[in-house]
């Protein structure tokens, strides 16, 4: 005979645990239903009645299946110098991130504790890895045959134009200059930009030092030695 499907609340078999989306109520000594995300336990279960769930009130949320008596409060509204990337709903907390051009250099439980400006790669260097919400830009020297003549947190190294006759050879920070005859191939005018980073939740890791104009925040452990400031070009 197939086993009977137990409906909550039910007493679990000795040594067994409650099923998925159920919890063991110590008072009733029964397996009872959890409340779904966006809800909380309004009335706890008894031996004869299951958990009564209710929706979270405005500005409160539960993200997981739960049996909490009250929903959690959403964080305070994002300040004018932050961007709300996730609104407060019944199922998720508000998330505030750094303003455009900045990244979160130091995270806290919910959101960001310290924003820092995205590193700008100086002429002769291009973006090797774009910045994200939680990591800085990584710059790299422009390889032979490529250049960047901007100070930018988005521009990559781009190829020198190829000339029939070169007037001035290109270098890492300057494009080649052709004689009055037109080049055989030329890049479209204007700098090449990397797209702005999409929202990511990756853990911030310190990039390798690269030249820049925006000094990054360097972190030390309490008694550790002080490394040189990352990628700083000074004043």
């Amino acid at each position: 005979l197939p086993a009977q499907v137990a409906f909550t609340p039910y007493a679990p078999e000795p040594g067994s645990t409650c099923r998925l989306r159920e919890y063991y109520d110590q008072t009733a000594q029964m397996c009872c239903s959890k409340c779904s995300p966006g809800q909380h336990a309004k009335v706890f279960c008894t031996k004869t009645s299951d958990t009564v769930c209710d929706s979270c009130e405005d500005s409160t949320y539960t993200q997981l299946w739960n049996w909490v008596p009250e929903c959690l409060s959403c964080g305070s509204r994002c300040s004018s110098d932050q961007v709300e990337t996730q609104a407060c709903t019944r199922e998720q907390n508000r998330i505030c991130t750094c303003r455009p051009g900045w990244y979160c250099a130091l995270s806290k439980q919910e959101g960001c504790r310290l924003c820092a400006p995205l590193r700008k790669c100086r002429p002769g260097f291009g973006v090797a890895r774009p910045g994200t919400e939680t990591s800085d830009v990584v710059c790299k020297p422009c390889a032979p045959g490529t250049f960047s003549n901007t100070t930018s947190s988005t521009d990559i190294c781009r190829p020198h134009q190829i000339c029939n006759v070169v007037a001035i050879p290109g270098n890492a920070s300057m494009d080649a200059v052709c004689t009055s005859t037109s080049p055989t191939r030329s890049m479209a005018p204007g700098a090449v930009h990397l797209p702005q980073p999409v929202s990511t939740r990756s853990q911030h890791t310190q990039p390798t030092p690269e030249p820049s104009t925006a000094p990054s925040t360097s972190f030390l452990l309490p008694m550790g030695p002080s490394p040189p400031a990352e990628g700083s070009t000074g004043d």
Partner: antibody, heavy 119, light 107 residues
Framework: KVQLQQSGAELVKPGASVKLSCKAS????????IHWVKQRSGQGLEWIGW????????NYNEKFKDKATLTADKSSSTVYMELTRLTSEDSAVYFC????????????WGQGTTLTVSS | DIVMTQSHKFMSTSVGDRVSITCKAS??????VAWYQQKPGQSPKLLIY???TRHTGVPDRFTGSGSGTDYTLTISSVQAEDLALYYC?????????FGGGTKLEIQ
């Protein structure tokens, strides 16, 4: 209400060390960054560094990294700054300060601790 | 390090006057500039951040403006209680630096 209470005035001899304290209240201690700022008599303000009790991260102004050491005692919600090998140049008022948001402009300041280095 | 220069150490004004205190950064700080007021024997008080955002409780006679490397704090109608030292500070990147201060004196 956020409050930063600093320890009292100190008179110390050249070459000695001193430990200043900044006790925070009115918020979750591990969620705020505490900064230290120096002000010499009749002069401007200099940022020394910050301590983040949430993860024990520290950041020093290069100019002060051999002078100041920042630590904290989470049980008493207090951040400390130890200054070593004191000279008359270290005579100043030292403020602790913090900021509510993730950008470093200081909404909250301690009352300041006057340090006098004199023989 | 970014150097913040307040060219006027002292400024003399009269009650009711409009006064502007200037601050120049040694490099572009992307409007990440704050202004503080400090009275004798007191801690500095935040007035303005992000160049032009007034801090809670700051009277609207205080306004900030600027971009790039040049920033200004303006008091539209000076009051006797505005006699104080005023500091600019960039909150762009470490090390965070302050201007040398401008002392506002009432004639």
């Amino acid at each position: 209400k956020v409050q930063l209470q600093q320890s009292g005035a100190e008179l110390v001899k050249p070459g000695a060390s001193v430990k200043l304290s900044c006790k925070a209240s009115g918020y979750t201690f591990t969620e705020s960054i505490i900064h230290w700022v120096k002000q010499r008599s009749g002069q401007g303000l200099e940022w020394i560094g910050w301590f983040y009790p949430g993860s024990d991260n520290i950041n020093y102004n290069e100019k002060f990294k051999d002078k100041a050491t920042l630590t904290a005692d989470k049980s008493s919600s207090t951040v400390y700054m130890e200054l070593t090998r004191l000279t008359s140049e270290d005579s100043a008022v030292y403020f602790c300060a913090s900021h509510e948001g993730p950008y470093v402009y200081f909404d909250y300041w301690g009352q300041g601790t006057t340090l006098t280095v004199s023989s | 390090d970014i150097v913040m220069t307040q060219s006027h150490k002292f400024m003399s004004t009269s009650v009711g006057d409009r006064v502007s205190i200037t601050c120049k950064a040694s490099q572009d700080v992307s409007t990440a500039v704050a202004w503080y007021q400090q009275k004798p024997g007191q801690s500095p008080k935040l007035l303005i951040y992000w160049t032009s955002t007034r801090h809670t409780g700051v009277p609207d006679r205080f306004t900030g403006s600027g971009s790039g490397t040049d920033y200004t704090l303006t008091i539209s109608s000076v009051q006797a209680e505005d006699l104080a030292l005023y500091y600019c500070q960039h909150h762009y990147s470490t090390p965070y630096t302050f201007g040398g201060g401008t002392k506002l004196e009432i004639q």
